[in-house]
Amino acid sequence: PLATIPVSTTSLTSSEGSTISTPSVDISTPVTTSIVGDQCSRCKNGGFWDGLKCQCLTPYYGESCEEVVNSIDIAPPETVSAQMELTVTVTSVKFTDELKNHSSQEFREFNKTFTEQMNIVYSGIPEYVGVNITNLRLGSVVVEHDVLLRTKYTPEYKTALDNATEVVKQKITKVTTEQIMTNDNCSALMCFNTTGTQVQNITVTQYDPVEECRQKAEEYEDYFLVEYRDQKPYCISPCESGFNASKNCNHGKCQMSQNGARCLCVTTETHWYSGEDCNQGTQKSHHHHHH
């Protein structure tokens, strides 16, 4: 037997002026039918029948997956990070082959001192997480390492991380200039060769809420946009109320189609409404306009 879907019919007039008696269905979307066993459901737009109801794919919803949602969940990461690849030359420790072995006691002791030193150097940077030595080589000890930075996601996260990387550069340059050997002795925790300090590469987390929004909106990508509320991005269509881009349909219902958002105007016992925003009311008995 066919699965019957109750549909409420409303008398609506499109902003072009013709009156349509229609369920809340976008008639411009193609119908694909999903059949499971003897249950047949008109699950449109890639939705499938789970035996009870249509399971719809983003950005669709409704009993037959015929309507387009007004907002799509996008989830920016809690935190975003940057990784700086740096090289410094430590002169207060002489290189030995054991330092190349990351499981040796030599490496562990060097790593402990180097980490303590860098924690002191970067202590004023709130985004600083730590350092990770990637390689040690001769010269006295050339230390290839990563400086890890992290911050909470905000729309300005790139600026925050860019600023933090600049401060890292300033601080490592300062310490490697100041903490130098005197008469082959080092009075600091570590001493450095000033000329051995280099920033090799900087990698920043890439997260673009606009791109995520467009991807999830699929063929409606041109009509969904990102607006921020309390520094959180929202992927919305103009049919979502309460945002700057929200479409005001006045005496009508906002509906998404593949041509964008449109207003379907209502007809009441006393008036019919027309206009792009359903703001032109015509009294049925007197036939004059109220603006």
């Epitope: 002489k94 030995t96 054991e98 030599e106 001192t113 570590m190």
Partner: nanobody, 123 residues
């Protein structure tokens, strides 16, 4: 893990001598760095005499010509011969070690420490 035990401290008159010893557990004297630090009451710990396996040595200016650092690899023992002792040499003397070949006088760069032995120079 390196374990260090100092001995040889005591009370001595000004101008006298003492020899401090530091016994290390394990076969560790063939590499790394060894040293003596001291800490007088109310003062920071300071480097007195240091030595590394590549031949580097350091003496604090205040002890040059009076103190001598040496090691006996066969006995895994570090020594500090202290001559012409002065009242200002009074302190707790600590033996320190690192498997790294160090050039630093900063005690925070040294990873292994003994419990210390007291040296009092008083008439």
């Amino acid at each position: 893990e390196v374990q260090l035990v100092e001995s040889g401290g005591g009370v001595v008159q000004p101008g006298g001598s003492l020899r401090l010893s530091c016994a290390a557990s394990g076969d560790t004297f063939s590499r790394g760095s060894w040293g003596w630090f001291r800490q007088a009451p109310g003062k920071e710990r300071e480097a007195v005499a240091l030595i590394s396996s590549d031949g580097w040595t350091f003496y604090a200016d205040s002890v040059k010509g009076r103190f001598t650092i040496s090691q006996d690899n066969t006995k895994n023992t570090l020594y500090l011969q202290m001559n012409s002792l002065r009242a200002e040499d009074t302190a707790v003397y600590y033996c320190a070690a690192s498997v790294l070949v160090l050039r630093t006088l900063n005690p925070k760069a040294w990873h292994h420490w003994g419990q210390g032995t007291m040296v009092t120079v008083s008439s």
